[in-house]
């Protein structure tokens, strides 16, 4: 999906008002210095591409985050503010949801969510030069 036509400011508002709090809740009990940020993004569409991938695509050691509250809210925000997102993405993530077993918070998942926090912070500061 091409995130170029999203309403970035409205997605930012949804992140600041609710998604960010759910990410913090998920990471509660974890030190902010525990994980190094290894995933980066260069602009807002790129950030959303990376956020979409890390949130909804299963990775080794972290089968799925899609059922977490922050993920459901991310999906809702993208569905509302990114025209065409629902048609291209929702069915795929729903198929994954059916295959998924019980929720398990592994260290790998915590690391992945830490990366997500970094991506979201970068999304919110699009004018900053890439480090």
């Amino acid at each position: 999906y091409d995130f170029t036509n999203c309403d970035f400011e409205k997605i930012k508002a949804a992140y600041l008002s609710t998604i960010s709090k759910d990410l913090i809740t998920y990471m509660s009990g974890t030190k902010s210095t525990e994980f190094n940020n290894t995933v980066s993004c260069s602009n807002r569409p790129h950030c959303l591409t990376e956020i979409q991938s890390l949130t909804f695509n299963p990775t080794a050691g972290c089968a799925s985050l899609a059922k977490e509250m922050f993920a459901m809210k991310t999906k809702a925000a993208l569905a509302i503010w990114c025209p065409g997102y629902s048609e291209t993405q929702i069915n795929a993530t729903q198929a994954m949801k059916k295959r998924r077993k019980r929720k398990v918070t592994t260290n790998k998942c915590l690391e992945q969510v830490s990366q997500l926090q970094g991506l979201w912070r970068r999304f919110n500061r699009p004018l900053l030069k890439q480090q």
Epitope: A14, P83, I90
Partner: antibody, heavy 120, light 111 residues
């Protein structure tokens, strides 16, 4: 069962406000959109706005911007639509309608409608 | 004045086919595959018939079909039956600000 139940008919004076409720049951309230649509006597359907409780997002039709407020109470699975500065042209049946999960612009479940009459 | 334009009326005899059009712009119908159609009988709430241009809602007979060409969407009812007599409304998604637009409605009469 899966349904939306709306509050009863209202008679209001011009210039006043009305608040209509819509109680959801049988589905996960927060994940869906709750839209509000009205129909004046003998007229067509008109969309007022939508709320997606999961993310607290509301979007209003330009025509009603500043005059309509849509809210939701997730603890009671109830959505509300308040319309202010009422005039006679606001006399209509007001429907709440569920927007499909993540496809909030398709209304797959409707309330029974609430008749709001604005008359002096 | 509705944002989407529908003919006020359409008619057909039992067994015949009838097509109802819904015309918009490139900012709504032409820009997205997010057209839906609703059936409304007198005194009743509307019912979703077609969504995503051509997908039938559950329980809707396959006599109802939807299509789109450019800025115009169409609802076709084939093998008309008496119970198909109702008002039909089209809607289209119209971007993140406008969100949803309704057509003015078409009264379908089964002769």
């Amino acid at each position: 069962q899966v349904q939306l139940v709306q509050s009863g008919a209202e008679v209001k004076k011009p210039g006043s406000s009305v608040k209509v409720s819509c109680k959801a049951s049988g589905f996960t309230f927060g994940s869906y959109g709750i839209n509000w649509v009205r129909q004046a006597p003998g007229q067509g359907l008109e969309w007022l706005g939508v709320i997606v409780p999961l993310v607290g997002v509301t979007i209003y039709a330009e025509k009603f911007q500043g005059r309509v407020t849509i809210t939701a109470d997730t603890s009671t699975s109830t959505a509300y639509m308040e319309l202010s500065s009422l005039r006679s042209e606001d006399t209509a049946v007001y429907y709440c309608a569920r927007g499909q999960e993540y496809f909030y612009w398709y209304f797959d479940l409707w309330g029974q409608g609430t008749l709001v009459t604005v008359s002096s | 004045q509705s944002a989407l334009t529908q003919p006020p009326s359409a008619s057909g005899s039992p067994g015949q086919s009838v097509t109802i059009s819904c015309t918009g712009t490139s900012s709504d119908i032409g820009g997205y595959n997010r057209v839906s159609w609703y059936q409304q009988h007198p005194g009743k709430a509307p019912k979703l018939m077609i969504y995503e241009v051509n997908k039938r809602s559950s329980g809707v007979p396959d006599r109802f079909s939807g299509s789109k060409s450019g800025n115009t969407a169409s609802l076709t009812v084939s093998g008309l039956q008496a119970e198909d007599e109702a008002d039909y409304y089209c809607t289209s998604y119209a971007g993140t600000d406008t969100f949803v637009l309704f057509g003015g409605g078409t009264k379908l009469t089964v002769l």
